[in-house]
């Protein structure tokens, strides 16, 4: 089952996600999407990183921490009831089916 996180309408929501880079600066791509993690990639992508930097993000969705050190937690600004639901944080580790997938449930009050 998904870990549940809560936020109030008009506030910021924080969805934690971490990994340990194999070596300093040796990053793997990460994607955040709305909806449970599918077999591959992320559905409804809201933010994505590559091996170096953030390369895609959408309004109100931001990386919250020091992602170059493995903190890929997500901040959603000024949430509404429509932001409720499951979010997928996917650590895209090279190789067949090596990805780490985290489904996080956001409840807006």
């Amino acid at each position: 089952s998904e870990v549940e996180y809560r936020a109030e309408v008009g506030q910021n929501a924080y969805l934690p996600c971490f990994y340990t880079p194999a070596a300093p600066g040796n990053l793997v791509p990460v994607c955040w999407g709305k909806g449970a993690c599918p077999v591959f990639e992320c559905g409804n992508v809201v933010l994505r990183t590559d091996e170096r930097d953030v390369n895609y993000w959408t309004s109100r969705y931001w990386l919250n921490g020091d992602f170059r050190k493995g903190d890929v937690s997500l901040t959603i600004e000024n949430v509404t009831l429509a932001d409720s639901g499951i979010y997928c944080c996917r650590i895209q580790i090279p190789g067949i089916m090596n990805d780490e997938k985290f489904n996080l449930k956001l409840v807006i009050k």
């Epitope: 910021n12 933010l47 309004s59 931001w62 990386l63 919250n64 000024n78």
Partner: antibody, heavy 122, light 109 residues
Amino acid sequence: EVQLLESGGGLVQPGGSLRLSCAASGFTFSSYAMSWVRQAPGKGLEWVSAISGSGGSTYYADSVKGRFTISRDNSKNTLYLQMNSLRAEDTAVYYCARGSYGTYYGNYFEYWGQGTLVTVSS
Amino acid sequence: SYVLTQPPSVSVAPGKTARITCGGDNIGGKSVHWYQQKPGQAPVLVIYYDSDRPSGIPERFSGSNSGNTATLTISRVEAGDEADYYCQVLDRRSDHFLFGGGTKLTVLG
């Protein structure tokens, strides 16, 4: 080309107020966190305040909390710093600086303005 | 609160290598960024995320970060490298940006 142009500096008496502006161009302003950084004469850099891209979250150094207010008008591509209850130790060149792509706090300062001098003296 | 410690000054002969350190408790767990500031000018980003170099910055500038020390290395130093150099981190415990005290690099001769 990214450009940041500060204005509003000048001479003000202790206890007085001043409002700094930073006009931004050459990038999608609302997509970036912004900060103010200051430098007292002959001293090092000191971060003053930051604001998220939407303006929904603000952060302050302890030395200015309660006296300074950061804000932004994304429709005008402009960053502001309202400075109240000014003290002699607030005398400095004030720079506005743009944060990094896709990060809530900005993480580092990719582009800087040329600065505006604020002098607090009687 | 978190403190970044830099040597006040470093001197180096032209063509040699200058190393400027930035000390902090487990600074290797944070991303470090470096700025160059020449007299009367605004700071310029020279290294970000420990070791990445912005476009336009010469390859002579490099960075590393591990343990309690981050280092900015300038190889084949030129007279034009004479400036103040500052390290910077984002301290997520306080949500404050922190700068080191700055290091004045003097190019001898």
